[in-house]
């Protein structure tokens, strides 16, 4: 059941003057236009559903060629209050306050938000990469300092008559760009209240959104050029399983990606490949246009379906995790990384899953759906897809439980 | 696997001289072109110096005639002569290794840790 023909009213159609808005390439993120202030300032803001903040650059960095500067603007308000927001290597800190902010290309509308103006950061901002902030579209759940700061998304719908939904359509070029050609070469598309059906082929299959924080779902079965991975399904989503447009790999678990690699490994195994390259450490390449895609297989995640017992599969292609990378010495080769990696904090399906396909965020409907994109990197032989139905038994218990940290579970 | 070791950085003052030098361990297809980049903070990532199995070798314009690079087959171990070195010359320097084609033309690039050359006027 793939819900095609039940949108509600203003769900259809065409969304024109938002398709082509998003800029950048898959190792360095996606980038929409948004304009911050009064008189506004405009600014690139990368796009990621893995976060909950809307955080822009407020004062000179090295990377960065303008920043959001708030003295200039006669709408901003501080808030009084800080946010300092930690990664695994790096981190940003900032102040937080409101501005006025709209998307060019994106709806007509302008809505007041919650900005952390970033006034320090350590390895956050990437040379070259032509963005100078982020837009969180995940739950209020994750926002930092806490929930009670409304993400950017929330506002705009609860501000606006726009539907609760957004879709992505990220564009993969299939070969490495420079700086030049990455600026002036088309990323993909957000749309903003809906669906643009042009994007995309075949059927939208949908599956849950298991909780709103992030964009958690629940894969159910891994199969490598259709051998199934055989593992305890908790195994997949553990701790958790999340679509995430700010992550580059897909990123599995550590059983399950040293599974997956042992599988990988083995049905390319014409000729050896050194551990470097599948830890992600050494490039592969091959002289111009030469590529042997057929020896590399197909990756398929099941998902749970909205159906009791059913489940749909999403496939992707060599084309899609081998990144394409810029030869260190020579462009005579086309080479690449291997852009599937191990996760200490579960599943992440990042650009190179996304990059094969339109993803549909409908919040409203608590789902996410995905059909084949329109502008996926493919060859002669072989395509990504959407299929389905599959029956899937017992599928709930293929989430994983976080356990509860907070004082009340020491409550008896 | 392509393992890289990288020694020879340090400081010194502008119109001195480093010698870096790179070893790879031994790999079945060989070395089929070794060199060296640099990256200095908040700027791009610049190639220096590259030489191939044949001896054959180039350099980025703004070290040309001050920079040999040089390289033992023997030992899969390359190095670059730095002479005169400017103030601009401060970065890290990254040794690189592309193999020659295996059976089915692919060949493997690999990058060593870097090691920092600090010029001061």
């Known amino acids: 059941e793939t819900d095609e023909e039940s949108e509600e009213p203003g769900r259809r159609g065409s969304f024109v003057e938002m398709v082509d808005n998003l800029r950048g390439k898959s190792g360095q993120g996606y980038y929409v236009e948004m304009t911050v202030g009064s008189p506004p300032q405009t600014l690139n803001i990368l796009v990621d559903t893995g976060s909950s903040n809307f955080a822009v650059g407020a004062a000179p960095h090295p990377f960065l060629h303008r920043y959001y500067q708030r003295q200039l603007s006669s709408t901003y308000r501080d808030l009084r209050k800080g946010v300092y927001v930690p990664y695994t290597q790096g981190k940003w800190e900032g102040e937080l306050g409101t501005d006025l902010v709209s998307i060019p290309h994106g709806p007509n509308v302008t809505v007041r938000a919650n900005i952390a103006a970033i006034t320090e950061s350590d390895k956050f901002f990437i040379n070259g990469s032509n963005w100078e902030g982020i837009l969180g579209l995940a739950y209020a759940e994750i926002a930092r300092p806490d929930d009670s700061l409304e993400p950017f998304f929330d506002s705009l719908v609860k501000q606006t008559h726009i539907p609760n939904i957004f879709s992505l359509q990220l564009c993969g070029a299939g070969f490495p760009l420079n700086q030049t050609e990455a600026l002036a070469s088309v990323g993909g598309s957000m749309i903003i209240g809906g669906i643009d059906h042009s994007l995309y082929t075949g059927s939208l299959w949908y599956t849950p959104i298991r909780r709103e924080w992030y964009y958690e779902v629940i894969i159910v079965r891994v199969e490598i050029n259709g051998q199934d991975l055989k593992m305890d399904c908790k195994e997949y989503n553990y701790d958790k399983s999340i679509v995430d447009s700010g992550t580059t790999n897909l990123r599995l678990p550590k059983k399950v990606f040293e599974a997956a690699v042992k599988s990988i490994k083995a049905a390319s195994s014409t000729e050896k490949f050194p551990d470097g390259f599948w830890l992600g450490e050494q490039l592969v390449c091959w002289q111009a246009g030469t590529t042997p895609w057929n020896i590399f297989p197909v990756i398929s995640l099941y998902l749970m379906g909205e159906v009791t017992n059913q489940s749909f599969r999403i496939t992707i292609l060599p084309q899609q995790y081998l990144r394409p990378v810029e030869d260190v010495a020579t462009s005579q080769d086309d080479c690449y990384k291997f852009a599937v990696s191990q996760s200490s904090t579960g599943t992440v399906m990042g650009a190179v899953i996304m990059e094969g396909f339109y993803v549909v965020f409908d919040r409203a409907r608590k789902r996410i759906g995905f059909a084949v994109s329109a502008c996926h990197v493919h060859d002669e032989f072989r395509t990504a897809a959407v299929e389905g139905p599959f029956v899937t038994a017992d599928m709930e218990d293929c989430g994983y439980n976080i356990p509860q940290t907070d004082e009340s579970t020491l409550m008896t | 696997d392509v393992q890289l070791q990288e020694s020879g950085g340090g400081s010194v003052q502008a119109g001195g001289s480093l010698r870096l030098s790179c070893a790879a361990s031994?790999?079945?297809?060989?070395?089929?072109?070794m060199g060296w980049y640099r990256q200095a903070p908040g700027k791009e990532r610049e190639l220096v110096s590259t030489?191939?199995?044949?001896?054959?070798?180039s350099y980025v314009d703004s070290v040309k005639g001050r920079f040999t690079i040089s390289q033992d087959n023997a030992k899969n171990t390359v190095y670059l002569q730095m002479n005169s070195l400017k103030p601009e010359d401060t970065a890290k320097y990254y040794c690189?290794?592309?193999?020659?084609?295996?059976?089915?033309?692919?060949?493997?690039?690999?990058w060593g840790q870097g090691t920092q050359v600090t010029v001061s006027s």
């Open positions: 690189y290794t592309k193999t020659c084609a295996n059976k089915l033309g692919a060949k493997f690039i690999s």
């Open positions: 031994e790999y079945t297809y060989g070395y089929c072109s």
């Open positions: 030489i191939t199995s044949d001896g054959s070798t």
